[in-house]
């Protein structure tokens, strides 16, 4: 049996060149004429070089799944899935997203160092000592509150709290 | 002895419509590929087209898809080649061509010019 | 699609001498590919094709041999007929059928 070379398949004992992009094969090749292919029916693709007998589906993005459609299928390329808005891709193949999952909020004593994108989590980061933050979206830790001189601090503020000045 | 004769070119205007015609003789006609290739002036040879022995299957190289139609009367032993929407580029001489794999015979084609 | 591409772009030589022209396709084609004449304002000719196969008629000074991805078209002994452009074309994996750009062979 003969190893084809890359970009042949093999009919009996025989290989034949493969279909392009965008292609499936018709009618497989003889003694004097190629393969001949024929386009993808809509709703299907093939996105490289192939010996396939039918194109692939395409792809349907789940709204259930918090997918959205980025980019329609074509007859060479498969559908591109994102996640909507909040969320980012937890199971990427190639550029297929499977299943998306909410940003992280980040919790009291943190800020977000990095926003969520489709396809990345939120990056949260400690505040500093001196600053607090509720969590959340918060960006920016912000600084304890300087009691007055006519205050008398309470409870000294954590990374999650402010400074309790009270008035007497 | 196999003669393929293209007529119908001549000059048209952008946007205007041509319909080539090849006269089949020597063969049977209703047996054969047929295909038409194009050469623009000093260019190499591009596939245009081709269409099966009972005119049930055509297929076109990607550009020439939506503007031109291929056809043929098995019993007229004539291939047809549908132009519209024509533009300068097109310009070119147009060769009818046997074989569904390599071309056997050619026609000696015929000049279509696109200009205004 | 499958480009062809040839070299080199032009062959001076004259009669009497070997001309080698060079097809190199862009992923294999396997034994699908031909060879065609063109002389000044006439159609192209059928060659060779199957990459080594002589067309009915053809002279056998022609010759084709290759597969997969490189193809060579071998004129033994030019004669003064032979100066021309050739071209190749693959039908391995149709459509599109496409060819290469052309080799011009020249008198020297």
């Known amino acids: 049996q003969p190893s084809c070379r890359q970009e042949e398949f093999l009919v009996g004992d025989e290989c034949c060149p493969m279909c392009n992009p965008g292609y499936h094969v018709k009618q497989v090749c003889s003694e004097h004429t190629g393969t001949v292919c024929a386009p993808c029916p809509p709703q299907t693709y093939t996105a490289h070089a192939n010996g396939l007998s039918k194109c692939l589906p395409c792809g349907v993005c789940d709204p259930d799944m918090g997918l959205l459609t980025w980019q329609e299928c074509s007859s060479w390329k498969d559908t591109v899935c994102r996640c909507i808005p909040g969320y980012f891709c937890e199971n990427q193949d190639g550029s297929h997203c499977s299943t998306c999952l909410q940003h992280t909020t980040c919790p009291p004593g943190q800020r977000v160092e990095k926003r969520g994108t489709h396809d990345q989590d939120t990056v949260c980061a400690d505040c500093l000592t001196g600053t607090f933050s509720l969590g959340g979206t918060q960006e920016e830790c912000l600084p304890w509150t300087n009691c007055s001189a006519f205050q008398q601090e309470v409870r000294r503020g954590t990374n999650s709290t402010d400074t309790t000045c009270s008035s007497q | 002895e196999v003669q393929l004769l293209e007529s119908g070119g001549g000059l048209v205007q952008p946007g205007g419509s041509l319909r080539l015609s090849c006269a089949a003789s020597g063969f049977t006609f209703s047996s054969y590929g047929m295909n038409w290739v194009r050469q623009a002036p000093g260019k190499g040879l591009e596939w245009v087209s081709i269409?099966?022995?009972?005119?049930?299957?055509?297929t076109y190289a990607q550009k020439f898809q939506g503007r031109f139609t291929i056809s043929r009367d098995n019993s007229k032993n004539t291939l047809y080649l549908q132009m519209n929407s024509l533009r300068a580029e097109d310009t070119a001489v147009y060769y009818c061509?046997?074989?569904?794999?390599?071309?056997?015979?050619w026609g000696q084609g015929t000049l279509v010019t696109v200009s205004s | 699609e499958i480009v062809l591409t040839q070299s080199p772009g032009t062959l001076s030589l004259s009669p009497g001498e070997r001309a080698t022209l060079s097809c190199r396709a862009s992923r294999s084609v396997g034994k699908y590919l031909a060879w065609y004449q063109q002389k000044p304002g006439q159609a192209p000719r059928l060659l060779i094709y199957g990459a080594t196969s002589r067309a009915t008629g053809i002279p056998d000074r022609f010759s084709g041999s290759g597969s997969g991805t490189d193809f060579t078209l071998t004129i033994s002994r030019l004669e003064p007929e032979d100066f021309a452009v050739y071209y190749c074309?693959?039908?391995?994996?149709?459509?599109?059928?496409?060819f290469g750009q052309g080799t011009k062979v020249e008198i020297k």
């Open positions: 061509a046997r074989g569904r794999g390599a071309f056997d015979y």
């Open positions: 074309q693959q039908y391995g994996s149709s459509p599109p059928v496409t």
């Open positions: 269409i099966n022995p009972s005119g049930d299957t055509t």
